[in-house]
């Protein structure tokens, strides 16, 4: 089941998926001056069986000016620079795919890919948020959002991250910073059954993501 909306935006924060649930689609978009090859796929699809998930189809772009097809290669470093979508830095790489059954990793870039990746997420997908450079987390409750099915409709949970540019905040004396609680909201908050995610194991990682960079855009 595809999620109806985009994940919520948080002021002065960006979000990124660590891995993508089976059923996720990534549009094959090309940068200006390029187009999909005639016989090319419209999108890549995360598919798999119980033991292995991978992206079906390959995105291929060709120059709008020429009719011949292009070869599928990894961009050169200088081409990579113009992409807005950056991979997580190595310490923040998602848990190994094998330990996340039913999920695909970030697809590798393709030649002349558009600067913005447009994903179509499915129920159970989780995305993680962090404050952008120059802002810090005033409050870091659950810094993630999950696409859930509630009353037959999909909805993203609201991340409880507040990013502030104000450096002068008051911290009351004599109080140690408590640990963020991993259990999230209790079931008593929802009035009917919701579809939850099997992606809980990423929660610990989310709390340590402050130094990582992610700027992929989603839709």
């Amino acid at each position: 089941e595809l999620c109806d909306d985009d994940p919520p935006e948080i002021p002065h924060a960006t979000f990124k998926a660590m891995a993508y649930k089976e059923g996720t689609m990534l549009n094959c978009e090309c940068k200006r001056g390029f187009r999909r090859i005639k016989s090319g796929s419209l999108y890549m699809l995360c598919t798999g069986n119980s033991s292995h998930s991978s992206w079906d189809n390959q995105c291929q772009c060709t120059s709008s000016a020429t009719r011949n097809t292009t070869k599928q290669v990894t961009p050169q470093p200088e081409e990579q620079k113009e992409r807005k979508t950056t991979e997580m830095q190595s310490p923040m790489q998602p848990v190994d795919q094998a330990s996340l059954p039913g999920h695909c990793r970030e697809p590798p870039p393709w030649e002349n890919e558009a600067t913005e990746r447009i994903y179509h997420f499915v129920v159970g997908q989780m995305v993680y948020y962090q404050c952008v450079q120059g802002y810090r987390a005033l409050h870091r409750g659950p810094a993630e959002s999950v696409c859930k099915m509630t009353h037959g409709k999909t909805r993203w949970t609201q991340p409880q991250l507040i990013c502030t540019g104000e450096m002068e905040t008051s911290q009351f004396p004599g109080e140690e910073k408590p640990q963020a609680s991993p259990e999230g909201r209790p079931e008593s908050e929802t009035s009917c059954l919701v579809t939850t995610t099997d992606f809980q194991i990423q929660t610990e990682m989310a709390a340590t993501m402050e130094t990582s960079i992610f700027t992929t855009e989603y839709q």
Partner: antibody, heavy 115, light 107 residues
Framework: QVQLVQSGAEVKKPGASVKVSCKGS????????MHWVRQAPGQGLEWMGV????????IYAQKFQGRVTMTVDTSTSTAYMELSSLRSEDTAVYYC????????WGQGTTVTVSS | DIQMTQSPSSLSASVGDRVTITCRAS??????LEWYQQKPGKAPKLLIY???TLAEGVPSRFSGSGSGTDFTLTISSLQPEDFATYYC?????????FGQGTKLEIK
Amino acid sequence: QVQLVQSGAEVKKPGASVKVSCKGSGYTFTDYAMHWVRQAPGQGLEWMGVISTYSGDAIYAQKFQGRVTMTVDTSTSTAYMELSSLRSEDTAVYYCARGVTFDYWGQGTTVTVSS
Amino acid sequence: DIQMTQSPSSLSASVGDRVTITCRASQDISNYLEWYQQKPGKAPKLLIYNAKTLAEGVPSRFSGSGSGTDFTLTISSLQPEDFATYYCQHHYDTPYTFGQGTKLEIK
């Protein structure tokens, strides 16, 4: 179910301080920041500030800077708002509200400042 | 600080009417806007968050739209229990200011 229960009404003299409490239940208290909002009689809503129930960091509206102190006690899942140097214009209903989108509110605490 | 201006300040309507309240921000606030309903002697209640998402348990006759600086709260068919005061508020940056309110009265 989620509940924010505030302390009872207070009558204070000008120059005094008042401390209003807000106890959260039915959810994980440290997951959600707590905001404080007040409403003078017949007036609109005025945001006073926000405190992280996780770290204790707080940001106050400029208007209340130096007079307001927000604290939390995670052991009792309670947030506090203390307003000092009270004047008659501080007569209002004070509310606590939970999270980024103020999805749950306390019932309000009436503070009357009168000589 | 970001100023939030609601219009109209008050509004008379009848049960079954379609009602629209607007809120304008003094600068671009993307979709970081909430709508609240308040009845006399009661705490405000969240209706819409992130400009267009209906809060849990809120009837579908309420809807929100807009982005940037101009936002709208629409009640498609007014019910007797909808007569109240409505406030918009942004959460783009502190201070999180509110609109001055729109009082919806029975005609």
